[in-house]
């Protein structure tokens, strides 16, 4: 006895695809909600870096800036900033004028 009537395989396929589509649409709408809740990046009081150490600037409640400093100091183990290509150097705040990445201190 056949497990299902003719065409049941394609029905299953269709419902599977529909399920995937629903899942993706749900994810997409989640992302859109998330995106609209994100505030634009706040400008810094300075156009170039003022911190010697690695810095992560995050926005707290009501837009207050919180600074999380990851200083490379012995005897702590140095932590690589993902994909920064700036191991053990002083890094400027990433801003429109300083550009991405590291600045090595110039010596005159």
């Amino acid at each position: 006895h056949p497990l299902g009537s003719p065409g049941s395989a394609s029905d299953l396929e269709t419902s599977g695809l529909q399920e995937q589509r629903n899942h993706l649409q749900g994810k997409l709408s989640e992302l859109q909600v998330e995106q609209t809740s994100l505030e634009p990046l706040q400008e810094s009081p300075h156009p170039t870096g003022v911190w010697k150490s690695r810095e992560v600037a995050t926005e707290g409640i009501r837009g207050h800036r919180k600074m999380v400093l990851y200083t490379l100091r012995a005897p702590r183990s140095p932590k690589m900033v993902q994909g920064s290509g700036c191991f053990g150097r002083k890094m400027d705040r990433i801003s429109s004028s300083s550009g991405l990445g590291c600045k090595v201190l110039r010596r005159h």
Epitope: Q42, E43, S44, P45, H46, P47, T48, G49, V50, W51, K52, S53, R65, M67, L69, T71, D92, S96, S97, L105, R107
Partner: antibody, heavy 119, light 106 residues
Framework: QVRLQESGPSLVKPSQTLSLTCTVS????????VTWVRQAPGKAPEWLST???????FYNPTLKARLSITKDSTKSQFSLSVSSVTSEDTAMYYC?????????????WGRGLLVTVSS | YELTQPTSVSVALEQTAEITCQGD??????VAWYQQKPGQAPMKLIY???ERPSGILDRFSGSSSGKIATLIISGARTEDEADYYC??????????FGSGTRLTVL
């Protein structure tokens, strides 16, 4: 040649609002950081306010309620107003091209304007 | 947030003067140094702890270790008599000037 010139009253009465203007030449205010700094007689300079290149304004938290900074790029001017002044606001007021940062060398200061608050 | 400097420093002519600046964030934040002569606006001598803007004499140098930054003036001259201020930032990145040091060249 880059130049900044402060202008405004040299004498203001207590409780009044002090309004100062900085007129710049030799550069455009568009895309620039501009700052107001003051220095009371015999004291250290004090950062008052910075307008970032994108228009965000930062104020000294202890004075924030009394300060206002505006920029008119078409007139090459930026202004500072200080409300409810007292004798403590007697100082030399400087406008500066830059954010007055420890991280760069771009400062250009005006000559300053001495403002006295007295009745 | 405060940056503490000695009120005054004296140095003999042609000798080396050192002016210190102490602050809790100075191991993480850069320091700049300004010279101010009577009737003039402050002029930046050093930024990023030890960098010199163009046009500043190499007699002026800077260093930083831990929570103390130092301005070094080698071969001091009479024209170096002035007030010197350090500058750094607080945790919100707002600029803060030091209390100031009067340099006397003997």
């Amino acid at each position: 040649q880059v130049r900044l010139q402060e202008s405004g009253p040299s004498l203001v009465k207590p409780s009044q609002t002090l309004s100062l203007t900085c007129t710049v030449s030799g550069f455009s205010l568009i895309g620039e950081y501009v700052t107001w700094v003051r220095q009371a007689p015999g004291k250290a300079p004090e950062w008052l306010s910075t307008m970032a290149s994108g228009g965000t304004i930062f104020y000294n938290p202890t004075l924030k309620a009394r300060l206002s900074i505006t920029k008119d790029s078409t007139k090459s001017q930026f202004s500072l107003s200080v409300s409810s002044v007292t004798s403590e606001d007697t100082a030399m007021y400087y406008c500066v091209r830059s954010s007055v940062s420890p991280g760069d060398d771009r400062d250009v200061w005006g000559r300053g304007l001495l403002v006295t608050v007295s009745s | 947030y405060e940056l503490t400097q000695p009120t005054s420093v004296s140095v003999a002519l042609e000798q080396t003067a050192e002016i210190t600046c102490q602050g809790d964030l100075l191991d993480d934040a850069y320091v700049a140094w300004y010279q101010q002569k009577p009737g003039q606006a402050p002029m930046k001598l050093i930024y990023k702890d030890s960098e010199r803007p163009s046009g500043i004499l190499d007699r002026f140098s800077g260093s930083s270790s831990g929570k103390i930054a130092t301005l070094i003036i080698s071969g001091a001259r009479t024209e170096d008599e002035a007030d010197y201020y350090c500058l750094s930032v607080d945790s919100s990145e707002y600029s803060v000037f030091g209390s100031g040091t009067r340099l006397t060249v003997l």
